[in-house]
């Protein structure tokens, strides 16, 4: 502890200028004071001034008023500092002395004489209020006041509590009168070192290093750090915990970027064709007769089906076609003949067979020729055998399909998969997505290509329902349920008639 006992001398009266021994001072009593402060004694005794002692210079002669003086010699009030816990009780001895010698240092002069002394014993609490008193004896009167105050940075009833206001990272506070800490605005905690974050800042997902701040922990965002960040690349999905990608209605795939209801959302099929939510692009158009193209956007020529027979030539008309028949033929499609085998109607080595008692005929054509009169070389491309926009080319007795990029097979019927290179390690399943292949990994593996062996197996607890296959590897501690047909949801828990094999991320 640390404090100061303060004694303010106010007035001393010694009208007759007498000493304690009855003698008078010549020419007058040049008065200074000795003060001794010590622990409480029921009977004051000589001995060390345990709480401190102080002397004054000569303050006046015989009777005088003592003015307050804050510095230099003759300071008033007198200061008696102590470095211990103030006990609340004390003994005080004030002696008035006459000196014939030096005004400033009378204590050292020989021949000093006692004028009078007073002794005060009692209790005194720490406080700013001065206690005023007056002591008389037969010859003198002394008016004075005193108090005990704590030294700077010491507080409490006994000045025993040290407290220093501070404003750094070990505390932001001021000191209360009892020495307890009073936190500065925006700070809290035992030592006022914990900032009060922005109001509403999520307790677990946010923190702050200074008041009214809200810094988000990884996986969280928003002003109050209460919004999770979905998996990177999640297109049409949301999260309830960080890095999740729970698909919005009508969307599927690891990143919720596969439109499960493309037909309804986009109506891609034209000219009255039928749209199905399936196929490599998520939909397939089935064209009405007379239309073709991926979206049935191309109208077929009315002559495209080669309706004119026997070498008749076809001409397109507004809503139909017209056959121009060669000599010897008639009918809408030139199907009727006026010729017989006698007219040698069969070309290219075709053999003629009479029918209907010779009134008509039929040609039997050699290989690679066709038509009523074997007049046409066989065009193996007429049946549009090449799928997915492939170009048909006749190659002698056979034909080949020249496929568009991304397709293969004899009829261009096979979609070339990014998965063809088998990029997924450790038995991972490959999914073709627009942005490239994505692997869903078997239990115990993760990474873009299932190349990382993980110690924690998120599938170990069997989180997938309804016979779904569990994979890990989308992100740490995540799993993927690949649902069987008829089930959806992050754990394949919902029975809904959706197209099969759309994985959902958990």
């Amino acid at each position: 502890g640390s404090g100061i006992f303060q004694l303010r001398l106010q007035e001393f009266v010694n009208q007759r200028g007498m000493l304690a021994n009855g003698q008078s001072c010549e020419p007058g009593c040049r008065t200074f004071f000795r003060i001794c402060l010590k622990h409480f004694q029921a009977t004051f005794s000589e001995g060390p001034c345990t709480f401190g002692n102080v002397s004054t210079p000569v303050l006046g002669t015989n009777s005088f008023v003592v003015r307050d003086k804050n510095s230099g010699s003759g300071r008033n009030p007198l200061q008696l500092p102590f470095n211990f816990t103030w006990p609340g009780t004390f003994s005080l001895n004030i002696q008035a002395w006459h000196t014939p010698g030096d005004d400033l240092r009378p204590e050292t002069s020989p021949g000093n004489s006692l004028i009078s002394q007073i002794i005060i014993q009692g209790s005194l609490a720490v406080g700013k209020i001065w206690r005023t008193d007056e002591q008389n004896d037969t010859l003198t009167r002394l008016s004075y006041s005193y108090r005990v105050i704590c030294s700077d940075n010491y507080y409490g009833e006994s000045c025993s509590r040290l407290c220093k206001k501070r404003d750094d990272h070990f505390g932001h506070y001021e000191c209360q009168p009892d020495g307890s800490l009073s936190c500065l605005p925006g700070w809290t905690g035992k030592y006022c070192d914990q900032p009060i974050c922005l109001s509403g800042c999520h307790e677990q997902n946010g923190y702050c290093s200074k008041p009214d701040e809200c810094i988000c922990r990884p996986g969280w965002q928003g002003r109050l750090c209460n919004e999770c960040i979905p998996h990177n690349g999640c297109r049409h999905g949301t999260c309830s915990i960080p890095w999740q990608c729970a698909c919005d209605e009508g969307w599927g795939g690891l990143f919720c970027d596969q439109d499960l209801n493309y037909c309804t959302h986009h109506s891609p099929c034209k000219n009255g064709s039928t749209c199905s939510n399936s196929g490599p692009k998520g939909y397939t158009c089935t064209c009405l007769p007379g239309y073709t193209g991926e979206h049935c956007e191309l109208g077929l020529s009315k002559c495209a089906s080669n309706p004119c027979r026997n070498g008749g030539s076809c001409k397109d008309q507004e809503n139909s076609y017209h056959c121009l028949c060669p000599p010897g033929y008639y009918g809408q499609h030139c199907e009727h003949s006026t010729l017989t085998c006698a007219d040698s109607p069969c070309f290219n080595g075709g053999s003629c067979r009479e029918r209907n008692q010779g009134s008509s005929y039929a040609c039997e054509c050699p290989p690679n020729f066709t038509g009523s009169n074997c007049e046409k070389k066989v065009d193996r491309c007429t049946s549009n055998p090449c799928a997915n926009g492939g170009q048909c080319q006749n190659r002698g007795p056979s034909r080949t399909c020249r496929c568009r990029p991304g397709f293969t097979g004899t009829h261009c019927e096979l979609h070339i998969s990014d998965c063809a290179r088998s990029p997924c390690a450790h038995g991972g399943t490959c999914h073709d997505l627009e942005n490239g292949p994505v692997c869903t990994c078997p239990a115990g593996f993760s990474g873009r290509r299932c190349e990382v062996r993980i110690t924690h197996d998120a599938c170990a607890s069997g989180p997938c329902f309804n016979g779904a296959t569990c994979y890990t590897g989308l992100s740490p501690n995540n799993f993927v349920c690949n649902c069987p047909y008829g089930f959806v949801g992050s754990r394949c828990e919902f029975p809904v008639g959706l197209p099969p094999s759309f994985p959902w991320v958990a």
């Epitope: 940075n153 990272h169 070990f170 290093s209």
Partner: antibody, heavy 121, light 106 residues
Amino acid sequence: EVQLQESGPGLVKPSETLSLTCTVSGGSISSSSYYWGWIRQPPGKGLEWIGDIYYTGSTYYNPSLKSRVTISVDTSKNQFSLKLSSVTAADTAVYYCAREAVPLGGGSDYWGQGTLVTVSS
Amino acid sequence: SYELTQPPSVSVSPGQTASITCSGQRLGDKYASWYQQKPGQSPVLVIYEDSKRPSGIPERFSGSNSGDTATLTISGTQPMDEADYYCQAWDRDTGVFGYGTKVTVL
């Protein structure tokens, strides 16, 4: 008993970056009662405070070194690190890591044993 | 920048009292800590918050701090107390050490 252990290269070339790590054992670096500091002592000279860090990542640096110092924390490994860039021979010193206790008014009650880093080509 | 000044050396006879001062502008308004460092060893905290002793520090170590001066007092100095002593205080958010005082026990 809390223990701190400094680790890192003992020799760094001038103009390069000095990197040290302090591993804390016997206590959590994520305690709200402590900051984690770096102090250095050139041979035969006194102590110089470099900077400190709280488990949340809040940092405080000595203004005389601020432009060259970075202190970071990895709570998962119970470690904190010091990087001092563009070093010169004047950065040759024993580097200590220490725990600064809020309840002790910022007094450092635990220190590492120190690691001597020499800057020389 | 804030500076703390210490005498370079203090000599004391065994059993006597050694006083080490540390001066800085209005240092009494800050908390002072004291560290003991023996050759080849890490510093050890001997006084914190002006006058408090950590557990394990002998009672002969005491401290005070007022005005512009903090003082570390070693009463009944022993030969094992021979070491360098550093005062330390915080100036806002920056730690500041004194230059150090070598205490020699004669």
